[in-house]
């Protein structure tokens, strides 16, 4: 606000006032009178730029007069009092109320003093973020969606991600006239590495004290990625039993594991136990390629592993005791 003038009366008011759609707002406006200065205010007037006539007048002898009596009210001005506070309350804010207003004091003998105030009509948006569940498409698709509904002015949406990708943001009219719904999609090429990772949608708006952060956990549906572990290339005869594990990453979860060999069904010394294959001790060398086939809703994938059980002196540190 401007500092009070020395030796002159000054109208004090903020340059901009925010108000919320449908709510009430006060446009503050005061006359600052230096200590020694005598002044007499006979009239307070509010008008809107670009419109003829006044929207609100308070006259020292006649009291208030409003263009819209149900929507306007002088907050402090009263008959029989010094008119120093022209603050005006507006009820039921509408989009079309946004604009520049002039608050004017008619003071004697100093003359008229006025100030302009910009009324911003805001609407606080509602924000949501949701995952867009996708499959491996090989091309960029939306994996997350962030929506800021019914904001005025439109909210500003940005994304934070370590996964790469790019935003695609669009606007559409909100439910209430003058409001805007902003929709932003986070787009990337889906991969299994993306599944379960998160991206953050950041929504900024004048009505927020601080930005709103909405985290989305991504979902990428993909067929099983399979590998077999548990073999260290160092198995020998007459040692303990060992275990091979079929490691599968998939979304949705695997529905079944099937063990076999390149020669067909499993040999007697290999026993399937779901994701694991138990290899019992053998008495002669073997050279067998095991196959683990994993199925989920999107399909089946398999991995192969060739296991050799070699002759050689058993030791504490070698053999089939890999588990």
């Amino acid at each position: 606000w401007p500092p009070p003038g020395t030796g002159d009366i000054v109208v004090q008011a903020p340059t901009q006032v925010p108000g919320f759609l449908g709510d009430s707002v006060t446009l503050p406006c005061y006359l600052q009178v230096p200590g020694m200065e005598e002044t007499h205010v006979s009239q307070l007037t509010w008008s809107r730029h670009g419109e003829s006539g006044s929207m609100a007048v308070f006259h020292q002898t006649q009291g208030p007069n409003y263009s819209e009596p149900k929507r306007l009210e002088f907050v402090a001005a009263r008959l029989g009092t010094e008119l120093r506070d022209a603050s005006l309350r507006m009820f039921g804010l509408r989009v079309e109320d946004e604009g520049n207003y002039t608050c004017l004091f008619v003071a004697f003998p100093q003359g008229s003093r006025s100030v302009d105030i910009w009324l911003r009509v805001l609407a606080k948006p509602q924000n949501t973020a949701e995952v867009q569940k996708v499959q491996l498409t090989g091309k960029p698709v939306p994996v997350a969606r962030c929506v800021s509904t019914g904001g005025r002015p439109p909210a500003h949406i940005t994304w934070h991600s370590d996964l790469g990708g790019m935003p695609n943001t669009s606007q559409a009219p909100g439910f209430l006239s003058g409001t805007v719904t902003v929709t932003s999609l986070w787009i990337l090429v889906p991969s299994s590495q993306v599944d379960g990772k998160s991206v953050t949608c950041k929504v900024e708006h004048e009505s927020f004290e601080k930005p709103q952060l909405l985290t989305v956990n991504l979902t990428v549906y993909y067929p099983p990625e399979v590998s077999i572990s548990g073999y260290d290339n160092n198995w020998y005869l007459s040692q303990n039993e060992a275990t091979l594990t079929c490691d599968a990453r998939s979304n949705p979860e695997p529905t079944g594991y099937n063990w076999s060999t390149t020669m067909g069904p499993l040999p007697p010394f290999a026993v399937a136990q779901g994701a694991q294959l138990l290899i019992r001790p053998v008495d002669k060398p073997i050279n067998t390629t095991f196959i683990c086939n994993v199925t989920n809703a999107l399909g089946a994938r398999q991995a192969e592993l060739t296991v050799q059980v070699k002759e050689g002196p058993p030791s504490e540190h070698s053999g089939m005791s890999s588990n």
Epitope: V106, F108, P109, S112
Partner: antibody, heavy 121, light 109 residues
């Protein structure tokens, strides 16, 4: 047209009081500011006070505070100035003046014809 | 109380330009003094010309203009007419009271 018609000349003794009237016509009296000004023989003009006719709010020159009272009668659109404890140096022509407003500033717009007050023993 | 000083008399030729000034004993005249100018012709009532330093009263010819000139208030008459011959008074506002100048007798000759 706008007119201010003042009461006739007065002769008063020292220590007495005088009440001068100023009847307005041709404008909305209650929305006006009226100043009272005097001019002693061979002297310059001297501002006494102003009154806002609609409410009776006043502002007095400190020199006259306690001796002068300004009032209005809105029913007759008349302003009054009463000066008490008259002295010989109060002998002067007393004027009422309506302040006009240009939309930006005030000015001494219309003046009455003046009322001569003579204080003599 | 402040003293407001004007030129006692000035003369201007018909059609000529003349500037009447108004000095304050308290220092420079500013817009916060809301300088007023009134005219009084012989045998006639006072008439307001200027208010608030430079605002011409309705009906006042454009040849009259008010301003601040250096540290003084000024009334400039451009293209003087014989009927402009009169006494001109300056009035200044000092926070809570008006003070009148002594007046300038303007002769159009």
């Amino acid at each position: 047209q706008v007119q201010l018609v003042q009461s006739g000349a007065e002769v008063k003794k020292p220590g007495a009081s005088v009440k001068v009237s100023c009847k307005a016509s041709g404008y909305t009296f209650t929305s006006s500011y009226i100043s009272w000004v005097r001019q002693a023989p061979g002297q310059g003009l001297e501002w006494i006070a102003w009154i806002y006719a609609g409410t009776g709010d006043t502002n007095y020159n400190q020199k006259f505070t306690g001796r002068v009272t300004m009032t209005t009668d809105t029913s007759t659109s008349t302003a009054y100035m009463e000066l008490r404890s008259l002295r010989s140096d109060d002998t002067a022509v007393y004027y009422c003046a309506r302040h006009g407003y240009t939309g930006r500033g005030w000015y001494f717009a219309v003046w009455g014809q003046g009322t001569t007050v003579t204080v003599s023993s | 109380q402040a003293v407001v000083t004007q030129e006692p008399s000035l003369t201007v030729s018909p059609g000529g330009t003349v500037t009447l000034t108004c000095r304050s004993s308290t220092g420079a005249v500013t817009t916060s003094n809301y300088a007023n100018w009134v005219q009084q012709k012989p045998g006639q009532a006072f008439r307001g010309l200027i208010g608030g330093t430079n605002n011409r009263a309705p009906g006042v010819p454009a040849r009259f203009s008010g301003s601040l000139l250096g540290d003084k208030a000024a009334l400039t008459l451009s293209g003087a007419q014989p009927e402009d011959e009169a006494e001109y008074y300056c009035i200044l506002w000092y926070s809570n009271h008006f003070v009148f100048g002594g007046g300038t007798k303007l002769t159009v000759l």
